[in-house]
């Protein structure tokens, strides 16, 4: 004969545990029903009566099967530098994430506690590591033969155009100026932008005669977040 199915509340067999979506009530010493997400325990179980559940009130929630006496409060409304990516419901907390052009400088269990604007690389510096939702932009000096003339959290250093006849040589913050009307560009026209969010970091040039000149040498790869420094500007 199949074993009888026990209905809550019931006393568990010695050494056994309660089933899924049940909990052991120490006072009643019985296995009792949990409340479903969106509910909480209004009345705890006894030896003869099961848990009584009730719906969460407005601005409160429970995300899991539970036996908590009160639902959890939803987080405060999203700040102006955030967007609400998940609304507060009876079954889930509000989630705030940083709006485009910002990154999460201080995260919490879900969403973001503190957003900060993505660092902007100043002229002579380019984005060396795009920002992400959780990391700032990294800026680095433009390598010889490249330039950036913008203050931007998305622009990378770009190669100087190749002139038939150079009027003004390019440097780290300025493209070359050609005297002929049809320069040979080493790249396609138009600025190269990285998608938002982007991340840059501090940049240090070695000593050079002019602040605008390119650092003596180097090629780079992206890296993690860092505080603002030479070559970057805050918002």
């Amino acid at each position: 004969l199949p074993a009888q199915v026990a209905f809550t509340p019931y006393a568990p067999e010695p050494g056994s545990t309660c089933r899924l979506r049940e909990y052991y009530d120490q006072t009643a010493q019985m296995c009792c029903s949990k409340c479903s997400p969106g509910q909480h325990a209004k009345v705890f179980c006894t030896k003869t009566s099961d848990t009584v559940c009730d719906s969460c009130e407005d601005s409160t929630y429970t995300q899991l099967w539970n036996w908590v006496p009160e639902c959890l409060s939803c987080g405060s409304r999203c700040s102006s530098d955030q967007v609400e990516t998940q609304a507060c419901t009876r079954e889930q907390n509000r989630i705030c994430t940083c709006r485009p052009g910002w990154y999460c400088a201080l995260s919490k269990q879900e969403g973001c506690r503190l957003c900060a604007p993505l660092r902007k690389c100043r002229p002579g510096f380019g984005v060396a590591r795009p920002g992400t939702e959780t990391s700032d932009v990294v800026c680095k000096p433009c390598a010889p033969g490249t330039f950036s003339n913008t203050t931007s959290s998305t622009d990378i250093c770009r190669p100087h155009q190749i002139c038939n006849v150079v009027a003004i040589p390019g440097n780290a913050s300025m493209d070359a100026v050609c005297t002929s009307t049809s320069p040979t560009r080493s790249m396609a026209p138009g600025a190269v932008h990285l998608p938002q969010p982007v991340s840059t970091r501090s940049q240090h040039t070695q000593p050079t005669p002019e602040p605008s000149t390119a650092p003596s040498t180097s090629f780079l790869l992206p890296m993690g977040p860092s505080p603002p420094a030479e070559g970057s500007t805050g918002d």
Partner: antibody
Framework: EVQLVQSGAEVKKPGATVKISCKVS????????IHWVQQAPGKGLEWIGR????????EYAPNFQDRVTITADTSTDTAYMELSSLRSEDTAVYYC???????????WGQGTTVTVSS | EAVVTQSPATLSLSPGERATLSCRSS?????????ANWVQQKPGQAFRGLIG???DRAPGIPARFSGSGSGTDTTLTISSLQPEDFAVYYC?????????FGGGTKLEIK
């Protein structure tokens, strides 16, 4: 003149650890990321990871992140790549580089051959 | 994990011909998400970065090399092959916090 000079060839046993150095000159090491790339015999390139010598921040390829440590010593202008728990498939040439898809500063070390054999 | 697929694996052409090498991203459009780059490797020589930002030639790279991107694909075109262009070409795509190289295309003389 820009140069990246790597340490010599290594022969290691499976399970061992190897540490390769990359001494840079001709530029300020803090201005650029140093990358490490693997090329196994007859195979293509695999990006291992990079270090930002300015602050020591690192990022690693998912395939390597559990076994690799990349560091940089700005006082000696040297970057290091340490690979642990070596196995036969780690037999390869390892290159350090300033190559970076966000810049146009393109210099590579001469490569270090690592042979893993019992 | 992201996969970068290059095609063809081998391309046999003659000097003067046009070469088209393709690179496909397993996730997302290369023009916005992956910041496509192309690197050249010749036997016994150092690697050389050719293209950055999907379509920017690196300083000193001849005008016959050009890059373009559309959707999940990025392409390296060599308009008129010179003898020194026969080599292995790798594309590299950026995935949030790491680079991924394609398997390479060997460009050989027909």
């Amino acid at each position: 003149e820009v140069q990246l000079v790597q340490s010599g060839a290594e022969v290691k046993k499976p399970g061992a650890t190897v540490k390769i150095s990359c001494k840079v000159s001709g530029f300020n090491i803090k201005d650029f990321y140093i990358h490490w790339v693997q090329q196994a015999p007859g195979k293509g390139l695999e990006w291992i990871g990079r270090v930002d010598p300015e602050d020591g921040n690192t990022e690693y390829a998912p395939n390597f992140q559990d076994r690799v440590t990349i560091t940089a010593d700005t006082s000696t202008d040297t970057a290091y790549m340490e690979l642990s728990s070596l196995r036969s498939e780690d037999t390869a040439v390892y290159y350090c580089s300033t190559w970076d898809g966000f810049s146009y500063f393109d210099y590579w070390g001469q490569g270090t051959t690592v042979t893993v054999s019992s | 994990e992201a996969v970068v697929t290059q095609s063809p694996a081998t391309l046999s052409l003659s000097p003067g011909e046009r070469a088209t090498l393709s690179c496909r991203s397993s996730t997302g459009p290369v023009t916005t998400n992956n910041y496509a780059n192309w690197v050249q490797q010749k036997p016994g020589q150092a690697f050389r970065g050719l293209i950055g930002g999907t379509n920017d030639r690196a300083p000193g790279i001849p005008a016959r090399f050009s890059g373009s991107g559309s959707g999940t694909d990025t392409t390296l075109t060599i308009s008129s092959l010179q003898p020194e262009d026969f080599a292995v070409y790798y594309c590299a795509l950026w995935y949030r916090n790491h680079w991924v190289f394609g398997g390479g295309t060997k460009l050989e003389i027909k």
